[in-house]
Every structure is written in structure tokens, then in C-alpha cells.
Interface confidence: low
């Protein structure tokens, strides 16, 4: 004969106010003969929740017909759950005794708690872009959870962050709670492809935390470096000058050429390439028409990046019958 087991499969039952909670209890054997009762709590002060044979329990119904001879399911439903119903519920097998029934075996218990899952965390970054080596703040919010205990962690590219402040509101008793956390992140030049992650763990999530993310590409501005060079070869009476704009982000960029202070309107060839770190390079070629009698030519490549102040680089072409070496300087 198989030994009796009282099986309460749920370790924890999280229910919402007003709903019906089903507390499961099955037995593996009909022996010994005797009733199964439900209690909340343990010890002499435990509260009787349901007794099939006697008492009035208007909010409790059984899942199956307990009068059937071979019934092994003693699960119950409790309707209209309120905060007063929280606690640990036990189904308890009694054997026939004299003069009264004797407790034989108890189930492991099911803890009933009021539960509400946190909303998906929303991560917001700074309103304006910031350059590397500066600190930016990210906020993470999640709402509507219960119970109040919750864990929030910040990560940058999988590495846990420590510089953050977290608040859970309200501080007193409530049906539901909210969490808000602000993390401070120092930007690195290679952070275009980086992510910050806010991770929220709560008992209702059964070990699978919720995550909200923000891309640092929305928060970072990597200013470009400029270099203007003259190509060593000269084709006829034309000289090719190159302006290389390196390692900038975001892509928003305006480039203009000036010849002896006059902005040039004519088309120039250019290419945009993306680096592995997510930054961009822009190369622009400018063909200068020269003649042997012409005065020296000063070319300026001016770049306006992401609405910031323009930066420029100058190159002086000293043009003679025998073309001289190039020279360049920079202007702030």
C-alpha cells in the first residue's frame, strides 16, 4: 500500500484582490479513512478555513465532489479575496479516533500573498547629447507591483553599475508600489554601441527579471578630428586636396570648402564610412584649379557637427612652376 502523501503543488500562490483563489490539495491514498480539513496557519491558534462535515463557509467551494467514494482531490476555491486572506494554508488529513478525529498528516502548505507584477521598466536618458568623459544620468521607472520588496540593478554592457540611487514609493502600506532609480554613467568614446540596462526582480516574476534598455548612442556626441592634406600628384593644372573628418557621432555633419576665404559652391566628391565602434568617418575631395601665374591658394575645410560650433582646418598651397611641398595649419 502506497504511503499517504498530501500534495500541495503550489509553493506560493499570488492572487489579486477580488479574484478567486484556488488552493490545490490531492492525496495519493484513500487510507487511512478520515476527513481532510483546511487551516490557515499552524499550532493551536490556527484558523479553520473549511470542514466538509460541519460549519458554514460561504466563500469556500470545493473543486471536486468530496462525497464521491474515490475522491482524492481536496482542492478548494476561496472567492472575493481581500488583504485579510493572506497567510499559509494547509490541507490536513485526519484519521478516525475516539472520541474525536486525530491529525494524521499535513500538506507542506501554500502561502497565499497579494501579488501584482511590476510594469516593464522604462529607461530614459538625458535630453541633450554629451561628449565622452562627462557623466550622464539615466532614470528607470516601474509601477504597479506588490509586495513592496523589489530589487533593481543597473548594467552597462553587461557590467553592473554601482553609482545609482533608488526609491520605492509609497513608504507605507499600499495596494501597489512604484520604483524609480537614477544611475550616473561616465561616457567613453567607444560608447556609441553601448547599452544601459535596468533590471527589476520581483517575487511575482518567478525568477525572470524584467529589463528596460537605453542606447548610449542617444546620449553621446563624439566630436570629429579634422585633417586636410594635399595629394602629392598634380594632374594638369589641378591639385586634389582631401579633408578627412574622423571618428564622429552622430552622423549629422555639414562640410564646406573655402578658397582664399570664399565659400566654394561647386560639387565635391565625398564618402561616408562607419567604424566598428559605431562612429563615422567622412572624406571630402576638392579639386583646385591653378595656373603658374596664380597667387598662393589657402583652402579651408569647415565642419559643423550636430549643431555645434564649426571647426576648421587650413591648407596653404604654394603654387610655383615647380610645385612646392604642402604645408598646413589649424584654426580654432
Amino acid at each position: 500500500e502506497e504511503e499517504l502523501q498530501m500534495i500541495q503543488p503550489e509553493k506560493l500562490l499570488l492572487v489579486t484582490v477580488g479574484k478567486t483563489a484556488t488552493l490545490h490539495c490531492t492525496v495519493t491514498s484513500l487510507l487511512p479513512v478520515g476527513p481532510v480539513l483546511w487551516f490557515r496557519g499552524v499550532g493551536p491558534g490556527r484558523e479553520l478555513i473549511y470542514n466538509q462535515k460541519e460549519g458554514h463557509f460561504p466563500r469556500v467551494t470545493t473543486v471536486s465532489d468530496l462525497t464521491k467514494r474515490n475522491n482524492m482531490d481536496f482542492s478548494i476555491r476561496i472567492s472575493s479575496i481581500t488583504p485579510a486572506d493572506v497567510g499559509t494554508y494547509y490541507c490536513v488529513k485526519f484519521r478516525k479516533g475516539s472520541p474525536e478525529n486525530v491529525e494524521f498528516k499535513s500538506g507542506p502548505g501554500t502561502e497565499m500573498a497579494l501579488g501584482a507584477k511590476p510594469s516593464a521598466p522604462v529607461v530614459l536618458g538625458p535630453a541633450a547629447r554629451t561628449t565622452p568623459e562627462h557623466t550622464v544620468s539615466f532614470t528607470c521607472e516601474s509601477h504597479g507591483f506588490s509586495p513592496r520588496d523589489i530589487t533593481l540593478k543597473w548594467f552597462k554592457n553587461g557590467n553592473e553599475l554601482s553609482d545609482f540611487q533608488t526609491n520605492v514609493d509609497p513608504t507605507g502600506q499600499s495596494v501597489a508600489y512604484s520604483i524609480r532609480s537614477t544611475a550616473r554613467v561616465v561616457l567613453d568614446p567607444w560608447d556609441v554601441r553601448s547599452q544601459v540596462i535596468c533590471e527589476v526582480a520581483h517575487v511575482t516574476l518567478q525568477g525572470d527579471p524584467l529589463r528596460g534598455t537605453a542606447n548610449l548612442s542617444e546620449a553621446i556626441r563624439v566630436p570629429p578630428t579634422l585633417e586636410v592634406t594635399q595629394q602629392p600628384m598634380r594632374v594638369g593644372n589641378q591639385v586634389n586636396v582631401t579633408c578627412q573628418v574622423r571618428k564622429f557621432y552622430p552622423q549629422s555633419l555639414q562640410l564646406t570648402w573655402s578658397e582664399n576665404g570664399n565659400v566654394c559652391q561647386r560639387e565635391t566628391a565625398s564618402t561616408l564610412t562607419e567604424n566598428k565602434d559605431g562612429t563615422y568617418n567622412w572624406t571630402s575631395w576638392f579639386l583646385v584649379n591653378i595656373s603658374d601665374q596664380r597667387d598662393d591658394v589657402v583652402l579651408t575645410c569647415q565642419v559643423k557637427h550636430d549643431g555645434q560650433l564649426a571647426v576648421s582646418k587650413r591648407l596653404a598651397l604654394e603654387v610655383t612652376v615647380h610645385q612646392k611641398d604642402q604645408s598646413s595649419d589649424a584654426t580654432p
Epitope: 502523501q5 500534495i7 500541495q8 503543488p9 503550489e10 509553493k11 506560493l12 500562490l13 499570488l14 492572487v15 489579486t16 479574484k19 478567486t20 483563489a21 484556488t22 490545490h24 507542506p108 502548505g109 501579488g115 501584482a116 507584477k117 516593464a120 511575482t204 516574476l205 518567478q206 525568477g207 525572470d208 524584467l210
Partner: antibody, heavy 119, light 112 residues
Framework: QVQLVQSGAEVKKPGSSVKVSCKAS????????ISWVRQAPGQGLEWMGG?????????SYAQKFQGRVTITADESTSTAYMELSSLRSEDTAVYYC???????????WGQGTLVTVSS | DIVMTQSPLSLPVTPGEPASISCRSS???????????LDWYLQKPGQSPQLLIY???SLQSGVPDRFSGSGSGTDFTLKISRVEAEDVGVYYC?????????FGGGTKVEIK
């Protein structure tokens, strides 16, 4: 006796999405977990994720499917749904829904839905 | 994730004879409530899986009592006392202690 009835077979192109439904009858829907398990041809069983309708819209997913699978439940119709996006040929499988207590023992299973991904 | 390992991969059986399948988990499935969260399922040819045993040793309602489960912690066994022709199929163990739920690779039981 609980019955889980799934939607019919689907043939999909790579890169597309599929949404499989699972309607429960004959038992409480909300307090139970609905899990989704798939089985590739000639292969074993693989848990994709699950949802407990009473707790709302947040589902639990296996890491392998995170970002590609969405599991939802409609309490009013006692129906659970599993949507898998960015389909590839290796997603060709029979997809089962199964009901369990909490996220534990899977006591009742649907008949399965064959999803074929082919160009 | 908890890794489940089943053996043997294939089990040829003779009707009326006993059969045994082993399942091992990469970590203990014994919960503090005293129950081992280990289930056994049978998938008959062309059918959906069906629950045989839950909590390591509890027989699911409607399952013939020739099936029994035993074990605790990390080592579990499914026994069929007398194999019948209708018992052929693939048997899977599954841990239900934590998500993701994970299955063993399966044991194919076939008549010799």
C-alpha cells in the same frame, strides 16, 4: 476534464511571423500557467516560455527565444497565444501548449500545431 | 539552466517484463517543502506528451499503477513493472523546480 485545442497547421516563409492559439475548456484558466513547448522533427521537447493569465501580460521566456517570442493570454476567451517572429527553417516544429499549476507540472497538453518554415 | 540527462537512449523491451529509465539533473530538484520537482512524460507515436508521474513519485490520475517513480535530489528512476504493447513511445523527464523548465533528451521504448 481540461481540454486544450490549438489552431491549425501553418506554412510560413523565412523572416515572417506565426501566431498559434490555444483555447482551454473544462477548467479554471486564469490561475494556471500555460506553457509553450516545441518539438522539431525527430527531436526532443523544448520549453519556450509560459504565462499565468491572472498575473497579467508579463510572460516568462527561455533565453534562447527572448526577443523573438511573445506569449499572451485572453482571460475572456480562455485562450493563450504564442507568436514567433523572424522565422527560420530551424523553427520548423510541432508547437504544443500545455497547462500546469504555477509554472510546474504540465498536466494537460494541446494536440500540437505543425509550423513549417520554407521558402 | 538545469540540465537533465536521461539513459538509456533506446530501450528494447519484452511485453510482460519490467523496464527502468534513469534521469539525472545537474542540480538538486528537492525543494525546501520536501517535494522533488521532477516529472515523467510519455509521448506515444503521433500523439502529444502525457503526464505519468509528478513530484518524482506521485502517479497522475488515470495512469496505470504499473508505472512508478522514485528518487530524490539529482537521481531519479521511472519503472514499468510489466511492459505492455501500449507503453511504447518516448519517455521524457522534466524538472519543474525553476524556469526555464528543461527536459531530458528522451528514452525510446520499443518492443523487441
Amino acid at each position: 476534464q481540461v481540454q486544450l485545442v490549438q489552431s491549425g497547421a501553418e506554412v510560413k516563409k523565412p523572416g515572417s511571423s506565426v501566431k498559434v492559439s490555444c483555447k482551454a475548456s473544462g477548467g479554471t484558466f486564469s490561475n494556471y500557467a500555460i506553457s509553450w513547448v516545441r518539438q522539431a522533427p525527430g527531436q526532443g521537447l523544448e520549453w519556450m516560455g509560459g504565462i499565468i493569465p491572472i498575473f497579467g501580460s508579463t510572460a516568462s521566456y527561455a533565453q534562447k527565444f527572448q526577443g523573438r517570442v511573445t506569449i499572451t493570454a485572453d482571460e475572456s476567451t480562455s485562450t493563450a497565444y504564442m507568436e514567433l517572429s523572424s522565422l527560420r527553417s530551424e523553427d520548423t516544429a510541432v508547437y504544443y501548449c500545455a497547462r500546469g499549476v504555477g509554472d510546474d507540472t504540465l498536466t494537460d497538453w494541446g494536440q500540437g500545431t505543425l509550423v513549417t518554415v520554407s521558402s | 539552466d538545469i540540465v537533465m540527462t536521461q539513459s538509456p537512449l533506446s530501450l528494447p523491451v519484452t511485453p510482460g517484463e519490467p523496464a527502468s529509465i534513469s534521469c539525472r539533473s545537474s542540480q538538486s530538484l528537492l525543494h525546501s517543502n520536501g517535494y522533488n520537482y521532477l516529472d515523467w512524460y510519455l509521448q506515444k507515436p503521433g500523439q502529444s506528451p502525457q503526464l505519468l508521474i509528478y513530484a518524482a513519485s506521485s502517479l497522475q490520475s488515470g495512469v496505470p499503477d504499473r508505472f512508478s517513480g522514485s528518487g530524490s535530489g539529482t537521481d531519479f528512476t521511472l519503472k514499468i513493472s510489466r511492459v505492455e504493447a501500449e507503453d511504447v513511445g518516448v519517455y521524457y523527464c522534466m524538472q519543474a523546480l525553476q524556469t526555464p523548465l528543461t527536459f531530458g533528451g528522451g528514452t525510446k521504448v520499443e518492443i523487441k
